[in-house]
């Protein structure tokens, strides 16, 4: 069997059924073109942070390489909520009602919802269980990530945004320790002075007393 590896979240929560129906939004595009500009061994972006060279963990997107093109496979997605999310018209309906809005084939469901089994309909994600952070054509919401034991929750999972996790106080994760949180250094080496405290993303920063040239421990 053929196929390529793709990294994504390993959630600890099992999904519940989606509640409510949502009006789908137009503007869906057709098939994916066979050339894209994403290159490199990894596209790392921690959930809840801006895109950039952040440390990856198992629940981070990486590049999935195809012969003809490369593109990002979604695990824990970049938390981009399109501005259209603010203007979504949600139908005030109770769980289990069988009403839905119809729309032409190929239209996308808004953030916070997913494709229903009923053509042209969207189901709302369940708060704290699943999310979609962009307009989508998915048959299910993406599962909320559970923070690891060495992490704390910076912000909870909502229907439009995945859980944001960060290292617990006194620990950090950077490019050199992508998989786990490491203990912050207790102090600077002899002849250096601390200029920056430890954060969840970096160790303490020290500079030489004489030169003022700084570096991370």
């Amino acid at each position: 069997a053929s196929g390529t590896e793709a990294a994504a979240a390993t959630p600890s929560k099992v999904w519940g059924s989606s509640a409510g129906r949502i009006e789908p939004r137009g503007g869906g595009r057709g098939a994916l073109p066979t050339s894209m500009g994403q290159h490199g061994p990894s596209a790392r972006a921690r959930a809840g942070r801006a895109p950039g060279p952040r440390p990856a963990r198992e629940a981070s997107p990486r590049l999935r390489v195809h012969k003809t093109f490369k593109f990002v496979v979604v695990g824990v997605l970049l938390q981009v909520v399109p501005s259209s999310a603010a203007t979504i018209k949600l139908h005030d309906q109770s769980i289990g009602t069988q009403q839905w809005e119809h729309s032409p084939l190929g239209e996308l469901c808004p953030p916070g919802s997913h494709r229903s089994e009923h053509p042209g309909a969207c189901n709302r994600c369940t708060e704290g269980v699943g999310y979609t952070n962009a307009s989508n054509n998915l048959f299910a919401c993406l599962p909320c990530t559970a923070c690891k034991s060495d992490e704390e929750e910076r912000s909870p999972c909502t229907t439009t945004r995945n859980t944001a996790c960060q290292c617990k106080p006194g620990t950090f994760r950077n490019d050199n320790s992508a998989e786990m949180c490491r203990k912050c250094s207790r102090g600077c080496p002899r002849g250096m002075v601390k200029v920056k405290d430890c954060t969840p993303w970096s160790d303490i920063e020290c500079v030489h007393k004489e030169s003022g040239n700084g570096h991370n421990i």
């Epitope: 196929g3 793709a6 894209m36 084939l105």
Partner: antibody, heavy 128, light 108 residues
């Protein structure tokens, strides 16, 4: 490498039950929708059921609805198909297949639908 | 349920010839949701095309897909010995997902 392996097939009498397993390796199992597809002797492919991502929404073909149940154990990287009230017409080779996955592109989440990884199949024979 | 009809049922061609396989849907299917598979006896099916026209990983460029609405086509530009098989179209446009009955491509 990326692969799916089915097991649990066999000969069973009409009305009885059977549970098929699909063991995955080489990829992050919980991130993909996994399908069951079958092929009866001398017939074409028939879609049976799917379970999306971490064990969320599941859908069934009308011919098996109410009799078959799809489930998954992400800790074991395994998908199951519980088949109850089996009929002669359920006789087939059963394949599990992975859906391609979800991509974030141009601010849209897209499922690029197509079963890109298949197991070799397990044979179920329903006969008295 | 979307019913897919494939034609012809069997296509007898020689090596190097062009094969054109048709898939017709009973109702409109978005081009994002139409896939093609190749299936050989004793083997697992193989994804060729998804989203109507995007080739799957490792699929040679002699395979191409096109179409929209209710009419879709798989084209094999020059038949190679390994291309003789049964080809299925499949739709993801609406549930239940369905396959066509298949087109068998055999050697003339």
């Amino acid at each position: 490498q990326v692969q799916l392996v089915e097991s649990g097939g066999g000969v069973v009498q009409p009305g009885r039950s059977l549970r098929l397993s699909c063991s995955a390796s080489g990829f992050t199992f919980s991130s993909y929708g996994i399908h069951w597809v079958r092929q009866a002797p001398g017939k074409g492919l028939e879609w049976v059921a799917v379970m999306w991502y971490a064990g969320s929404n599941e859908y069934y073909a009308d011919s098996v609805k109410g009799r078959f149940t799809i489930s998954r154990d992400n800790s074991k990287n395994t998908l199951y198909l519980q088949m109850n009230s089996l009929r002669a017409e359920d006789t087939a080779v059963y394949y599990c297949a992975r859906d391609q996955g979800v991509l974030l592109r141009f601010g849209e989440l897209r499922g690029y639908y197509g079963m890109d990884v298949w197991g070799q199949g397990t044979t179920v024979t329903v006969s008295s | 349920e979307v019913v897919l009809t494939q034609s012809p049922g069997t296509l007898s061609l020689s090596l190097g010839e062009r094969a054109t396989l048709s898939c017709r849907a009973s109702q409109s299917v978005s081009s994002s949701y139409l896939a093609w598979y190749q299936h050989k006896p004793g083997q697992a099916p193989r994804l060729l095309i998804y989203g109507t026209s995007s080739r799957a990983t490792g699929i040679p460029d002699r395979f191409s897909g096109s179409g929209s609405g209710t009419n879709f086509t798989l084209t094999i530009s020059r038949l190679e010995p390994e291309d003789f098989a049964v080809y299925y179209c499949q739709q993801y446009g609406s549930l239940p997902f369905t396959f066509g009955p298949g087109t068998k491509v055999d050697i003339k």
